[in-house]
């Protein structure tokens, strides 16, 4: 019967005791750069190409005995996830392998770097269809690497990487610290991160995505015929790399971006028990885990947006945090959020040409996140429009003056330590959805945007009591832009996007003891654009 | 339930060509190889080669390679061994089986084909 | 390759009587990653084509009398037959699956003695 790991990437219209998707990625190249391999393994064999490149260190220790198969076994497993004929998922799709780790699976920081310019300069020799490049390493956090990977990202190469095995922030590792690396981390048959002895899959803001990483049935380089079960990050990666190439088989004009964009939205939500991640990384990690699109065709008509965490802004006063969308990507809203509750709001800046969302804490606040909802919009303009802080009691107000344009996000940024904790809420008056409101001693940043048949609505969910969190999700067909608090409520710690609902976070009542401090309600923007629609009606 | 038919018995003179096939039912022809398997008159089971229909890959026993053809067309469910020149010697009982990556040995054999190569 | 080796050539047996045929492989083909020896048997009666008896050196197939079993690990292994009867006679051979060319015994002929 079908591996657990394949029925689990499989939607369940292709389901059956056979796993066959509709398109093997036979128009993708997947390099992968690991140990050496057994390309005769009849799993692979014709599959896979062995290229001439080498680059690993000396083996450790001086009693160390190279045995082939050991030698093969990391490299042999991975291939043969990507791109196996029986246990594979892209089984169409054809690789080329290069040696950067040594028979202990060991590698070096240039090593990779190498390894990664080869590519590139196989890539302008001989230019194909689209790449993919698998990196099945993780290391120390690298500077250097994760350049090397944002130059080919940006060359319209895919690179998908290990999350890294140490159950740690992934943040911590390159390549996986790369923002524009796919950063793969690894699940079990029950959707549970997979726990490797001691250690475990590493989480946290860097992983984009969860993949199957727990007794991976695969290619063994023991025997031709042999095959293996294997665990890991980088098992989790192979599965993304043989979607990714599915993927691009079917639409080989998709950039990185939307690649990115679909990986987050097919995947299955929800599932993963956060409760093994530390406390202070369930927020951050993404609960999702990679699948198969339900077609591979016809996704191009949806708005896709996805949540992007700063870095931690750490404790001083004025300490800010950045969060940055990818170069195709249009920032459509910014957010904030503190454990402490202690922040000074976020607003949306300009940073070499592109917009930014950046958070900033306030004294004697442990630090901020910013929160970036970060979409593909095609023909987008959108600009920020800020209203300084009202002299009126009424609050501060800003909205999309421009025809045309239509209000995708809300921000509010204070310079005041307290922001008038005991002033009643402000609430909106019905009837005008495209405009932000705020304190009255707060600064308010609408963004604003136009764009080919988009069109956006405001929704809202108030609890007059206060709450740990008050949710409020787009319904289907629509997609959640922008994400907020209505103001008035000190306790609120911030506000985030968990894929298509707007997530509002108060201090825990309890703790504090009070219970005055008014009603909570969560604003939901949610976006659908029409012309993508249409224009996918049109192609069909 | 699941079977492997071949095709009937061949009576050929050296020089000749032919193909001799293999369809199989009752289960996903595209998944699982098929290896051919020689048995000369008296003789013992010779592995020739292996085909996997749902990419036509093929590995050859090197001492057929360039003796014979392996191929299927899957959207037949049938595979298919081929000469293109026979010799006296090929003279044989010629058996299609199938194999799992899962299952890596023969458990479905086809009833066989005799192929007589004789002037 | 992988040279397989079985003996007896032939071995006559009463009825009832054990029968037990050794097969040599002149490499292992057990695997440490999966603890599996890649090692079949299968016997062929006159006229019909072979049937798979004993899988993974040990795995009885579905639908295989009792009576057959297999042992050894590594490179040497055997196929027992533990009370023979009539419908028993068939030529039985080995078959490595681990690498190619994937390779057979020369098989043993077992009769009524």
């Known amino acids: 019967s079908i591996p657990w790991n394949l029925e689990r990437i499989t939607p369940p219209r292709y389901r059956a005791d056979e796993y066959q998707p509709p398109d093997g990625g036979s128009l993708v190249e997947v390099y992968l750069l690991d140990t050496s391999i057994q390309s005769d393994h009849r799993e692979i064999e014709g599959r896979v190409m062995v290229t001439d490149f080498e680059n690993v260190p000396e083996e450790d220790g001086t009693r160390f005995h190279r045995q082939a198969s050991k030698c093969d076994s990391h490299g042999t497993h991975l291939a043969g996830v990507v791109s196996g004929r029986d246990a594979g998922v892209a089984k169409g799709a054809s690789m080329r392998s290069l040696r950067v780790l040594n028979c202990q699976g060991k590698g070096t920081v240039s090593g990779t770097l190498i390894g990664l310019e080869f590519i590139r300069k196989s890539q302008l020799v001989q230019p194909v269809g689209p790449l993919v490049v698998l990196l099945p390493l993780a290391g120390g956090y690298s500077r250097v690497l994760n350049a090397a990977c944002q130059r080919l990202a940006r060359a319209g190469v895919v690179l998908v990487t290990a999350a890294g095995n140490f159950r740690d922030d992934a943040c911590l590792y390159s390549p996986a610290s790369a923002p524009e690396v796919i950063t793969v981390g690894a699940t079990n048959a029950q959707d549970q991160p997979v726990t490797l002895g001691t250690l475990g899959t590493n989480f946290g803001r860097c992983v984009d995505l969860f993949a199957p990483g727990e007794d991976i049935i695969g290619a063994s380089s023991d025997c031709s015929t042999c095959f293996v079960s294997q665990s890991g990050t980088s098992q989790a990666a192979a599965h993304v790399a043989g979607i990714a190439a599915m993927m691009l088989s079917a639409e080989p004009e998709l950039t990185l971006a939307e690649l990115r964009q679909r990986l987050i939205h097919f995947s299955a939500k929800d599932v993963i028990n956060e409760a093994w991640f530390p406390e202070d990384q369930r927020v951050l990690t993404p609960n999702l885990v990679a699948a198969l699109p339900p077609s591979t065709h016809g996704a191009g008509w949806q708005l896709f947006c996805r949540t992007v965490w700063s870095a931690h802004s750490g404790p001083t006063r004025m300490a800010t945090a950045v969060a940055r969308c990818a170069p195709d990507e249009e920032l459509l809203s910014c957010s904030s959020f503190s454990r402490s509750g202690k922040r000074r709001g976020e607003r949306m800046e300009a940073q070499g040409g592109k917009l930014v969302c950046r958070a900033h804490n306030a004294f004697g606040g442990e630090g901020v996140y910013a929160i970036a909802r970060c979409c593909l919009l095609p023909q987008a303009n959108c600009s920020v429009h800020t209203a300084p802080p009202a002299e009126a009691s009424m609050g501060t107000r800003v909205h999309c003056h421009q025809q045309g344009h239509v209000l995708t996000g809300c921000s509010s940024h204070w310079e005041v330590e307290d922001l008038g904790t005991h002033k009643p809420p402000v609430l909106r008056p019905r009837g005008q959805p495209n405009q932000c409101v705020g304190h009255r001693e707060a600064s308010i940043h609408a963004s604003c945007c136009h764009a080919p048949g988009l069109e956006c609505k405001v929704k809202e969910h108030g609890i007059p009591a206060p709450q740990e969190q008050v949710t409020v999700a787009c319904e289907e067909g629509w997609t959640l832009t922008g994400c907020s608090a209505l103001p008035g409520t000190s306790h609120v710690l911030g506000a985030y996007a968990v894929d298509n609902t707007c997530v509002v976070r108060s201090r825990d009542v309890s703790t504090t003891g009070s219970t005055s401090e008014g009603a909570v309600t969560a604003v939901a923007i949610c976006c659908r654009s029409r012309h993508l629609a249409q224009a996918s009606q049109e192609l069909q | 339930q699941v079977q492997l038919v071949q095709s009937g018995a061949e009576v050929k003179k050296p020089g000749e060509s032919l193909k001799i096939s293999c369809k199989g039912s009752g289960y996903s022809f595209t998944n699982y190889y098929i290896a051919w398997v020689r048995q000369m008159p008296g003789k013992g089971l010779e592995w020739m080669g292996i085909i996997y229909p749902g990419d036509s890959y093929t590995h050859y026993n090197p001492k057929f390679q360039g003796q014979v053809t392996i191929s299927a067309d899957k959207s037949i469910s049938t595979a298919y061994l081929q000469w293109s020149s026979l010799k006296a010697s090929d003279t044989a009982m010629y058996y299609c089986?199938?194999?799992?990556?899962?299952?890596?040995?023969?458990?479905?054999w086809g009833q066989g084909t005799l192929v007589t190569v004789s002037s | 390759d992988i040279v397989m080796t079985q003996s007896p050539d032939s071995l006559a047996v009463s009825l009832g009587e054990r029968a037990t045929i050794n097969c040599r492989s002149s490499?292992?083909?057990?695997?440490?990653?999966?603890?599996?020896?890649?090692l079949a048997w299968y016997q062929q009666k006159p006229g019909q084509p072979p049937k798979l008896l004993i899988y993974?050196?040990?795995t009885r197939e579905s639908g295989v009398p009792d009576r057959f079993s297999g042992s050894g690990s590594g490179t040497d292994f055997t196929l027992t037959i533990s009370s023979l009867q009539a419908e028993d006679v068939a030529v039985y051979y080995c078959?490595?699956?681990?690498?190619?060319?994937?390779?057979f015994g020369q098989g043993t002929k077992v009769e009524i003695k």
């Open positions: 490499q292992s083909v057990l695997y440490s990653s999966n603890n599996k020896n890649y």
């Open positions: 078959q490595q699956y681990s690498s190619f060319p994937i390779t």
């Open positions: 089986a199938r194999d799992h990556w899962s299952r890596p040995f023969s458990d479905v």
């Open positions: 993974w050196a040990s």
